[in-house]
């Protein structure tokens, strides 16, 4: 999906009002210096591309974040403020339904969410190019 035509300011508002708080809740009890950020992003479409991929792609040691509150709100924000995004996510939704029902917070998932926080912070930088 090409995130170029999203309403970035609306997504930013959704992040600041709720998603950021859910990410902090998920990371509660973890020191902010515990994980090194190894990925970043260039402009806002790039940031959303990486945020979407990191939030919804299973990785080694962290099978699924998709059922977490911040992930569901991220998906909703992208669906509302990125034209045509929902249509591209039908297969992804099917995969999400097949994901584990139980939510287990592993150290790898904490590290992944720490990376997500960094990507979201970069997305919100005032000087970051729209595209």
């Amino acid at each position: 999906y090409d995130f170029t035509n999203c309403d970035f300011e609306k997504i930013k508002a959704a992040y600041l009002s709720t998603i950021s708080k859910d990410l902090i809740t998920y990371m509660s009890g973890t020191k902010s210096t515990e994980f090194n950020n190894t990925v970043s992003c260039s402009n806002r479409p790039h940031c959303l591309t990486e945020i979407q991929s990191l939030t919804f792609n299973p990785t080694a040691g962290c099978a699924s974040l998709a059922k977490e509150m911040f992930a569901m709100k991220t998906k909703a924000a992208l669906a509302i403020w990125c034209p045509g995004y929902s249509e591209t996510q039908i297969n992804a939704t099917q995969a999400m339904k097949k994901a584990r029902k139980s939510k287990v917070t592993t150290n790898k998932c904490l590290e992944q969410v720490s990376q997500l926080q960094g990507l979201w912070r970069r997305f919100n930088r005032p000087l970051l190019k729209q595209q």
Epitope: T38, C41, H46, S53, A60, E111, Q112, Q115, L127
Partner: antibody, heavy 117, light 108 residues
Framework: QVQLQESGPGLVKPSETLSLTCTVS?????????WSWIRQPPGKGLEWIGY???????SYNPSLKSRVTISVDTSKNQFSLKLSSVTAADTAVYYC??????????WGQGTLVTVSS | EIVLTQSPATLSLSPGERATLSCRAS??????LAWYQQKPGQAPRLLIY???SRATGIPARFSGSGSGTDFTLTISSLEPEDFAVYYC??????????FGQGTKVEIK
Amino acid sequence: QVQLQESGPGLVKPSETLSLTCTVSGYSISSGYGWSWIRQPPGKGLEWIGYISYYGSISYNPSLKSRVTISVDTSKNQFSLKLSSVTAADTAVYYCARTNLLYFDSWGQGTLVTVSS
Amino acid sequence: EIVLTQSPATLSLSPGERATLSCRASQSVSNNLAWYQQKPGQAPRLLIYDASSRATGIPARFSGSGSGTDFTLTISSLEPEDFAVYYCQQYSDWPQYTFGQGTKVEIK
């Protein structure tokens, strides 16, 4: 200390597919970062080809996108480049590099690929 | 595509002298700029990122400055091992990351 090493044929025929592999040691490619390819034609400057992140997102240089595939084999701690329909203009030293998806902090030593019949 | 123009193409200096290399972007890249050093037959090495932050292990004689379209790499006092080609790279314009054409710093 992460180390990267490119391998693959040094000679490829025009119209064929160039295939290179980068073997990473000292760091698990599924643990973090992005893994990138960059090339440098003889005596010329650098050109970014693309990357694959540790969580599977892929990005390509738009000028090469139609011909490039980057993939990863986590079991071997390797990532690969395929460039199809090559011409003499694709003759270059090809580097693999570790990236934070912005800049490139560790590089392989490079491998020269010549496109010629 | 953002074009990076480096100047001069070649800089002839003696060890101990100060080197000032320029990189100009065709449009603003904020501070999204890196500098690399490349010696003959070797891979590039990251020197500077975010326009002014030194990469791990890079000596303090290397410094970067600038923002927007005009950037400078300064080597305060050239050591023999500093004679090489230097490239700038912008990462403001994903997915079109570009490099400058390079500046060669040679022994006078």
